[in-house]
């Protein structure tokens, strides 16, 4: 027999409740706090959605980010000579996946063991503030990305140094920022041992007192503050910048450039499409939901939506792509298993050949292209 | 249309015992937290017990003034639910009603019309 | 447990009036509070749950309302089929637990 104070909390959002009932098991009897979840949470904490599904879309999210955002940090810190305020923007963006992918294998055995957190309170805030952190994070630095391409446009001029210590300036202001609005998510306990299902949950199963309106209040402010308005100025970025390629002259290589930013801004609004609109309205609603009616209807919707917001991690690298030229030469020469000081020996190699008679030697000094922006 | 019909009652002698039924229909029984709640004659609402869906492991919950007296017992397959009642004592003399818990735990709301119990020498 | 206290036994109102049912709780137990109407003879069934919101079917004359642990289920234009006790139950904490009822009587 369980005799305890069964209290109201709900998760991901679930409410479950302290309780004080007796509870027979046929395995003796404990004093304890209990927390208790209601039947549809039940469900969902013991369904394939969050057992099957989830750690599926993140182990796919884990294999493909981990490398991809890994090499992109890699080659915008060691292999780009200028450090253009994209390039900073991007690293930033790759650094902010890579530390919200990396806690992924923990967050994948979680759900594969029915959604059973056994490392820990500590483990179990990091996992939540990261996961949340990098949402927000990718939104500001895809903010940033989108303005200053299309500022490159309207003042095409040669890169300063004052321009990268204000990219640095912003990514650091970006990072305290991010810091600061997820601090509630370390602050506030995640783990709740449910002993109905036998199963510690993380973020899944909340107090009711604190989802009803804290957590309703808190991601309102995020999604208008962190996510409508940055948005706003992407689209805005992006509109304009559509207007100037519009009435820009085409030669080859503006058609070239026009083309990767159009290819750009595809993938930035699928971003927005498949992760980030999502995921932000399917948080007011859902909160919403609990704070007027006490439950949630779109629970379900709420779980998908926040689990597509991962693969951010996924299409950042698309951007990368599509921006820097560098990460374009490493990530097509990492496909082909070359390297890149092998491709340009090749290029030396056949340069040296065709122009043997007028010059006797041809070297590279340099195994790092220059990044057009 | 959510139906819940009990059965079983009638007068018994204290220190006996009954078993109560009720035949849930309109909704998918085994989806659903159920309960017992009781009336005693002229008085208030005061839960008795009450059963978890099969996520939940079937675990049942009981109050202080019933338990290791009483039993709860559901077959999902029949949506049924049950309450066994040994060593009855005058105060359990009451309406029971057999109730559902809403899915998401947000109160009680479907109850049966229920059946009466009468301990008596 | 908590305990739900519903002080009047009993409440008097003509047709057409409003009027108004308290409940207070123990102890903090958020917006967990539903209503429950009973008629004479028959079985409970609920009205509100949620403090505030009308289950399937509810006329909208039955409201609720909640400051801090007090509540409240409000008839409007009461008529003479409202007839009947009125229970409040605390849903946050289990048990789940019940005010001792309030009869609505028509003048």
């Known amino acids: 027999t369980i005799q305890g104070t069964n209290r109201s909390s709900k998760g991901r959002s679930l409410i479950g409740k302290v309780d004080g009932t007796s509870h027979v098991t046929g395995k003796g009897v404990t004093v304890e706090t209990v927390f208790s979840v209601d039947e549809f949470s039940a469900s969902v904490l013991t369904g394939k959605l969050t057992t099957v599904f989830l750690p599926i879309v993140y182990t796919i999210v884990f294999v493909v980010g981990l490398p991809s955002n890994g090499m992109a940090l890699w080659v915008f810190l060691f292999r780009t000579k200028k450090k253009h305020p994209a390039v900073i923007y991007m690293a930033n963006l790759a650094l902010a996946d890579l530390l919200s992918v990396i806690w992924f294998p923990l967050k994948i055995a979680y759900h594969i063991h029915g959604n059973n957190w056994i490392y820990g309170e500590a483990l179990c805030n990091v996992l939540i503030g990261f996961f949340y952190g990098n949402m927000y994070c990718s939104i500001l630095f895809m903010t940033c990305l989108s303005v200053q391409r299309y500022w490159v446009i309207v003042n095409p001029m040669g890169h300063s140094r004052k321009k990268a210590n204000i990219a640095i300036g912003i990514s650091l202001a970006i990072w305290l920022l991010i810091l600061l609005v997820t601090i509630p998510l370390y602050v506030v306990k995640q783990t709740i041992f449910i002993p109905a299902l036998n199963i510690t949950t993380c973020h899944d199963v909340l107090p009711e007192q604190l989802l009803v309106g804290d957590m309703f209040n808190y991601f309102l402010s995020l999604a208008i503050g962190v996510f409508l308005f940055p948005a706003f100025l992407t689209a805005s970025a992006y509109v304009l910048m559509i207007r100037m390629l519009r009435s820009s002259a085409m030669d080859e290589n503006s058609e070239k450039k026009r083309k990767r930013a159009i290819k750009l801004i595809v993938t930035v609004l699928a971003m927005y499409l498949i992760c980030f609109t999502p995921s932000n309205l399917l948080l007011v609603v859902h909160y919403f939901l609990i704070k007027s009616q006490g439950q949630s209807h779109v629970y379900a919707l709420y779980i998908v939506a926040l689990c597509l917001s991962t693969l951010n991690s996924c299409i950042d690298p698309f951007v990368y792509y599509f921006v820097s030229h560098d990460f374009r030469d490493h990530a097509k020469n990492a496909l082909l298993c070359r390297s890149v000081r092998t491709v340009k020996q090749m290029q030396v190699s056949l340069t040296s050949k065709k122009h043997s008679r007028k010059s006797s030697s041809y070297s590279s000094s340099s195994t790092t292209v220059k990044t057009s922006y | 249309e959510v139906q819940l019909i009990e059965s079983g009652g009638g007068l018994v002698q204290p220190k006996g015992s009954l078993k109560l039924s009720c035949a849930a229909s309109?909704?998918?029984?085994?989806?659903?937290?159920m309960h017992w709640v009781r009336q005693a004659p002229g008085k208030g609402l005061e839960w008795v017990a009450r059963i978890r869906s099969k996520n939940v492991h079937y675990a049942t919950y009981y109050a202080d003034s019933v338990k290791d007296r009483f039993t709860i017992s559901r077959d999902d397959s029949q949506s049924m639910l049950y309450l066994q009642m040994n060593n009855l004592k005058t105060e359990d003399t009451a309406m029971y009603f057999c109730?559902?818990?809403?899915?998401?735990?947000?109160?009680?709301?479907?109850w049966g019309q229920g059946t009466t119990l009468t301990v008596s020498s | 447990d908590i305990v739900m206290t519903q002080s009047h036994k009993f409440m008097s109102t003509s047709v057409g009036d409003r009027v108004s049912i308290t409940c207070k709780a123990s102890?903090?137990?958020?917006?967990?509070v539903a209503w429950h109407q009973q008629k004479p003879g028959q079985s409970p069934k609920l009205l509100i749950y949620w403090t505030s919101n009308r289950h399937t079917g509810v006329p909208d004359r039955f409201t609720g309302r909640r400051s801090g642990t007090d509540f409240t289920l409000t008839i409007s234009n009461v008529q003479s089929e409202d007839l009947a006790d009125y229970f409040c139950q605390q849903y946050s904490t289990y048990p789940f637990t019940f005010g001792s009822g309030t009869k609505l009587e028509i003048k």
């Open positions: 109730v559902r818990e809403d899915y998401y735990g947000s109160s009680y709301d479907y």
């Open positions: 309109g909704f998918t029984f085994n989806s659903y937290a």
């Open positions: 102890q903090d137990v958020g917006s967990a």
